[in-house]
Interface confidence: medium
Amino acid sequence: KLTIESTPFNVAEGKEVLLLVHNLPQHLFGYSWYKGERVDGNRQIIGYVIGTQQATPGPAYSGREIIYPNASLLIQNIIQNDTGFYTLHVIKSDLVNEEATGQFRVYPELPKPSISSNNSKPVEDKDAVAFTCEPETQDATYLWWVNNQSLPVSPRLQLSNGNRTLTLFNVTRNDTASYKCETQNPVSARRSDSVILNVLYGPDAPTISPLNTSYRSGENLNLSCHAASNPPAQYSWFVNGTFQQSTQELFIPNITVNNSGSYTCQAHNSDTGLNRTTVTTITVYAEPPKPFITSNNSNPVEDEDAVALTCEPEIQNTTYLWWVNNQSLPVSPRLQLSNDNRTLTLLSVTRNDVGPYECGIQNELSVDHSDPVILNVLYGPDDPTISPSYTYYRPGVNLSLSCHAASNPPAQYSWLIDGNIQQHTQELFISNITEKNSGLYTCQANNSASGHSRTTVKTITVSAELPKPSISSNNSKPVEDKDAVAFTCEPEAQNTTYLWWVNGQSLPVSPRLQLSNGNRTLTLFNVTRNDARAYVCGIQNSVSANRSDPVTLDVLYGPDTPIISPPDSSYLSGANLNLSCHSASNPSPQYSWRINGIPQQHTQVLFIAKITPNNNGTYACFVSNLATGRNNSIVKSITVSASGTSPGLSAGA
């Protein structure tokens, strides 16, 4: 099939294009080119007869067209009007016609663009700037570059007018950059020269240096002022409100007490019309001034931060003194003084370090004290406390829980039920509760300043039925005549009566037995071995009652004065001596024997076979209870007689 290929398809003005013919039939008589999509004699460009090799221009011939024997058409010096369709009409020898159409598009060679701006000196935070890429060109694409990067995404940057205009709203000093625009079409791409945006800003609040504000008579005062500004600021100095000079630096030699006062630096930007001032108070001392304390950390965090308190002003050859809570400094590894005593450092502050702190400067006549300074130590939160302490509630009542945790600043509270956040309040209130309000209630205390959080979890059970109670004890092994024991009946429940039984009987009347905490706690003072009984607590309300399992009190006692048996003290020679020692004690004591003061064996029974008069003497049994820490002993005299010398003597065992 006869086809036309345009090479190239997109043609730049002034260049040339070749309309290349493919699949040209054999046995041709001739062919003709026409402008447009159809054969129209009025729009014939050129005709060609093969037999005569004769080319004949038509009405649309411009003199820029060349036809080739293969029917291709070259058009030179392309102009915008050349855009469009071209039709080749082929006449075969048998006079049968064939047609094909091709096309190309003409684009101008783009000129180098330039940027125009509606505001050459925009003011920061006030003005908008609109950059426009010139010239306006049909069928061109516009692109923008900032510092040779594509445009950042910003709500303050807006493209409009087919991307030809870039608007910067509320310019800031950070918008000072190199801006370029680029135009593109299918045949060319051109970039503009850079335009530097000159944003007027400032002046910012000036900074006066040095920061030192205390001077002694006779020193030179040299103050310098600086404020960020475009164009650079103009500076003026005022002392106590009176204009001094228009310079960036203020120099006063050999100052006196009269030079004390407020020193103001004023920065002025003539383009923005703005003024900013900073004031510093300069104090010139003739003699040691009243000191004052500065701190490097006004809100230290407990157990984390150190605080350095410095006694101002710095005066050469001066003795500095410190007081805490109106006392001289205590000895503490957490308190450190600098070599000149001017700086007191508290390492790892605690909530007890609030002070007040005072420093003093010693002169020839007296000590000048600073005003007291109190530290605001941030601490906590500690573990929160949930009140009331009830864990068991009856359906239908109101549940009102309050949470508190020691904290500075005061903690912010959150409540969670079963791990799910409920509300951000210190109090949690649920009216008319039912069993489904049972759950794990967590209070979370958060200190926004330290960033620390602590939680406490409380189990709340809502039930008409009371649970089986249990007994907790503050002392599982009390010592007789020394310790007290407090039994507590768990859980703590609202509107509940607590009862106690000892060995299945109601409580005996005794000054050593005391009920407290709504009968929930039973305290036994000065326990005795007779208190080692089975204790049961019970809970009851109008619906149900329940008893705990018994808890048996294990009282540690003894050892009591031991008893040596048998009681005999006279023996016949040749008998066996078999002495047994026993002492009431819990736990069982350790036994040991001494004969005439000489340690023997650590057994409860002492056995000596076939004794003789040499075994006469004092036999002592020693008992000790490691649990009570108590000891006891008894001494027995044993007399051994020669056989047959005295009637009534024991034969021994």
């Epitope: 759950g439 794990l440 939680t455």
Partner: antibody, heavy 124, light 110 residues
């Protein structure tokens, strides 16, 4: 004595609505969150959702959202499950259950009281 | 929602053996000092039965040979000495958000 009993048709046609009722005895359902859990044959347990019979509040598993409805009749101490547009994949044993107070520590959502289960087959 | 991965899916053990099943959550199911993980036993044709609640608490009436432990995302269920009546499928379930169950572990006796 606490008891939960599921009831409803054992056979449901595809694209129809499955309906089950759970009848509770031994406690007032208004005091508990009531749940439905199902178990396809030979497969694991799937939680469907809960209803608070006191106020009709519900929460459903995302898988069933849009197909499931839970209702309650507190006068009869009953709650029900409706699952629409069923397919063979909905064939399962359906259990109603709740968190009781048999533990000293109580919390949503573990289940210590269950019905015996009701097998529902989806088939034409 | 939180996904539960239970392993193994089945296991065989002898009477008296110590048996351990693990369950891993796709994110932590612990909050405010508690772990919201529970374990159930299901015998064929019966409803599941709660054994362990809040990771380690033994449900009333459940033998002490059953125990649970873990926090965060990783949890373990243990039978200290396997008995013939322990043949069942065991499921873990979390309640940190809307509940989901593990896929189950089928326990058989060799």
């Amino acid at each position: 004595q606490v008891q939960l009993q599921e009831s409803g048709p054992g056979l449901v046609r595809p694209s129809q609505t499955l309906s089950l009722t759970c009848t509770v005895s031994g406690f007032n359902i208004k005091d508990y969150y009531m749940h439905w859990v199902r178990q396809p044959p030979g497969r694991g347990l799937e939680w469907i959702g809960w209803i608070d019979p006191e106020n009709g509040d519900t929460e459903y598993a995302p898988k069933f959202q849009g197909r499931v409805t839970m209702l309650t009749d507190t006068s009869k101490n009953q709650f029900s499950l409706r699952l629409s547009s069923v397919t063979a994949a909905d064939t399962a044993v359906y259990y109603c259950n709740t968190r009781g107070l048999s533990t000293m520590i109580t919390t949503r959502w573990f289940f210590d009281v269950w019905g015996q289960g009701s097998l529902v087959t989806v088939s034409s | 929602d939180i996904q539960m991965t239970q392993s193994p899916s089945s296991l065989s053990a002898s009477v008296g053996d110590r048996v351990t099943i693990t369950c891993r959550a796709s994110k932590s199911v612990s909050a405010s000092g508690y772990s919201y993980m529970h374990w159930y036993q299901q015998t064929p044709g019966k409803a599941p039965k709660l054994l362990i609640y809040l990771a380690s608490n033994l449900q009333s009436g459940v033998p002490s040979r059953f125990s649970g432990s873990g926090s965060g995302t990783d949890y373990t269920f243990t039978i200290s000495s396997l008995q013939p009546e322990d043949i069942a499928t065991y499921y873990c379930q979390h309640s940190r958000e809307l509940p989901t169950f593990g896929q189950g572990t089928k326990l058989q006796i060799t």
